[in-house]
Interface confidence: low
């Protein structure tokens, strides 16, 4: 049986059940290389409390559909005398990066995971030429996730003192110049994740090969190498390579750009101070507030919730968007879709789409940007579920009793973007981390 998602085959992936202190290793095409789980384990569970290993999915006992992968075992879980076997179930959804498997829950018999990934899309529009896992768990099993930094088009310009060259990078995947053929990037070779531009020429100085690594709790490293033979004439016989070190700052701060810290014989060392390198719980919340010791800030958007069936309305030319954030109030137009953001076509109001659901909510504060994300909406033709990204700005003189109103700013590949000026986005900092 062919591997259902070849893009995900090259790596052993990790997921964590934080509540129970369990680390899962997942290899969806072969087996994980962990002796204690046996030679054919595709899903290996490491219980750190009891220091034991269990195979909870066998690579030989795999069954697959387009959106679901199940690994059975021969181990009975013996629930009330039934003949059930321990198994793992991975539900795949279309995403814009390779993404990460997320642990959902475990019953007595079944370990459930969800994975939003380009590999599960019906169309190839988000697929990279080369992409590597872009997250890592530290020794305390806290997740550091750089997926939000991945550019689907264009690249980051590295801060460099050399006026004759420009170094462009992407994070964990190659630079897509087809979708965004910026004048300087247009000459970059396909597959490069680090592109050196000199005059009218562009050179591949690194492609992603291995996934993100953690070197210390707050330092992550990504290495790019130039795969093919054939040395560049300005590299003095050396093969080009790029090392990017992502550093979690010691306290809350605005975002910075990547900086070149060393360069020798086409070996480029880049340091990027960004809060995305910090553990995810420092940046994100599933509720509409971020506060407490862990986050160093106090943010509470819950006063923006609308009651009594009313919604915020944002005009998007062909569409009207109805928003009801930070609550579970049904939007009247949205046909019981549990939508936080509802898209209605002006010319045909029967065409209604959920552009993100209220139980699929993430509040993120990173590098000075406050963002509320709603995902899991109605599918587009690519298979990607519509989502909405609301970027908040602090405005102490906002109208509507300080609440302000959301403004639609555009759509890219079924992701809808809004800005929202409100006094409730004014962040209070606690200065200790």
């Amino acid at each position: 049986q062919a591997a259902p998602f070849p893009e995900l085959c090259s790596y052993t992936w990790e997921a964590v059940d934080t509540k129970n202190n369990v680390l899962y290793k997942i290899n969806i095409c072969g087996s994980v290389d962990i002796v204690q789980c046996g030679p054919s384990s595709a899903v290996c569970m490491h219980d750190l409390k009891t220091r034991t290993y269990h195979s909870v999915g066998d690579s030989v006992l795999r069954s697959a559909t387009r959106s679901l992968l199940e690994f059975n075992t021969t181990v009975s879980c013996d629930q009330q005398g039934t003949n059930h076997r321990v198994q793992s179930s991975i539900a795949f959804l279309c995403g814009k990066t390779l993404g990460t498997p997320e642990f959902v829950t475990a019953t007595f018999c079944v370990h459930y995971f969800e994975w939003r990934t380009t590999a599960a899309c019906k169309k190839d529009i988000f697929k990279a030429n080369k992409e590597v896992p872009c997250y890592v768990f530290d020794e305390e099993l806290r997740k550091h996730d750089l997926n939000p930094l991945i550019k689907l088009s264009g690249a980051y310009l590295v801060d460099d003192s050399d006026p004759d060259t420009s170094l462009f990078i992407n994070v964990c995947r190659d630079i897509d110049t087809l979708r965004d053929p910026g004048s300087q990037l247009r000459a970059c070779p396909p597959g490069t994740a680090a592109c050196l531009v000199r005059g009218h020429q562009a050179f591949d100085v690194g492609q992603p090969r291995d996934g993100l690594k953690v070197v210390r709790k707050d330092r992550l490293v990504l290495s790019y190498v130039r795969e093919e033979a054939g040395k560049l004439d300005f590299c003095d016989g050396h093969s080009p390579a790029v090392t990017i070190t992502f550093v979690c700052p010691s306290e809350r701060r605005e975002g910075t750009i990547p900086k070149l810290t060393a360069k020798s014989n086409c070996r480029y060392e880049i340091e990027w101070i960004t809060e995305y390198a910090c553990h995810r719980d420092y940046l994100e919340s599933k509720t509409c507030s971020l506060s407490g010791e862990q986050q160093d800030v106090s943010i509470d958007l819950t006063p923006l919730a609308q009651s009594g069936g009313s919604s915020y309305i944002s005009d998007g030319k062909e569409y009207l968007f109805y928003l009801n954030v930070c609550g579970e109030t049904e939007i009247q137009f949205c046909n019981k879709k549990q939508a936080a953001v509802c898209q209605v076509k002006k010319s045909d109001t029967s065409q209604v789409k959920a552009a993100g659901r209220y139980h699929n909510q993430t509040l993120r504060y990173s590098d000075g940007d406050l963002t509320l994300i709603y995902f899991g909406g109605d599918e587009c033709s690519s298979g990607f579920q519509r989502m909405s990204v609301i970027n908040f700005e602090c405005n102490k003189t906002a109208g509507n009793d300080g609440k302000g109103t959301p403004v639609f700013t555009g759509e890219v590949d079924c992701t809808y973007f809004f800005t929202w000026d409100t006094e409730y986005a004014c962040v209070h900092h606690h200065h200790h981390h």
Partner: nanobody
Framework: QVQLQESGGGLVQPGGSLRLSCAAS????????MDWYRQAPGKQREWVAT???????TYADSVKGRFTISRDNTKNTVYLRMNSLKPEDTAVYYC??????????WGQGTQVTVSS
């Protein structure tokens, strides 16, 4: 009726070359992602190469630099050019179309044998 038909397999000496073809009928060919897989005797089917609908190509490490995937939309055909063939490349080669609308479509396969 939707169909894929592979051809071009055969017996070749180590170091030799072959070009496999996969002709599609009944589908809008350019909308599909095309994959080549292979299955050696007694082994699981393994992925070889992919040509995305917008033109990008990816290869398994074992064939990188030796195999090239390409397509001709006017002929509704995808090709796999195989150079520097090795005995371990011996397998039945299958092509697959991944459509945004239909289920995945597989061809019947073509035998490639690399032997002196």
């Amino acid at each position: 009726q939707v169909q894929l038909q592979e051809s071009g397999g055969g017996l070749v000496q180590p170091g030799g070359s072959l070009r496999l073809s996969c002709a599609a009928s009944g589908i809008i060919f350019s909308d599909n992602r095309m994959d080549w897989y292979r299955q050696a005797p007694g082994k699981q089917r393994e992925w070889v190469a992919t040509l995305a609908s917008y033109g990008w190509k990816t290869y398994a490490d074992s064939v990188k630099g030796r195999f090239t995937i390409s397509r001709d939309n006017t002929k509704n055909t995808v090709y796999l050019r195989m150079n520097s063939l090795k005995p371990e490349d011996t397998a039945v080669y299958y092509c697959k179309a991944s459509s945004p609308v239909l289920n995945d479509i597989w061809g019947q396969g073509t035998q490639v044998t690399v032997s002196s």
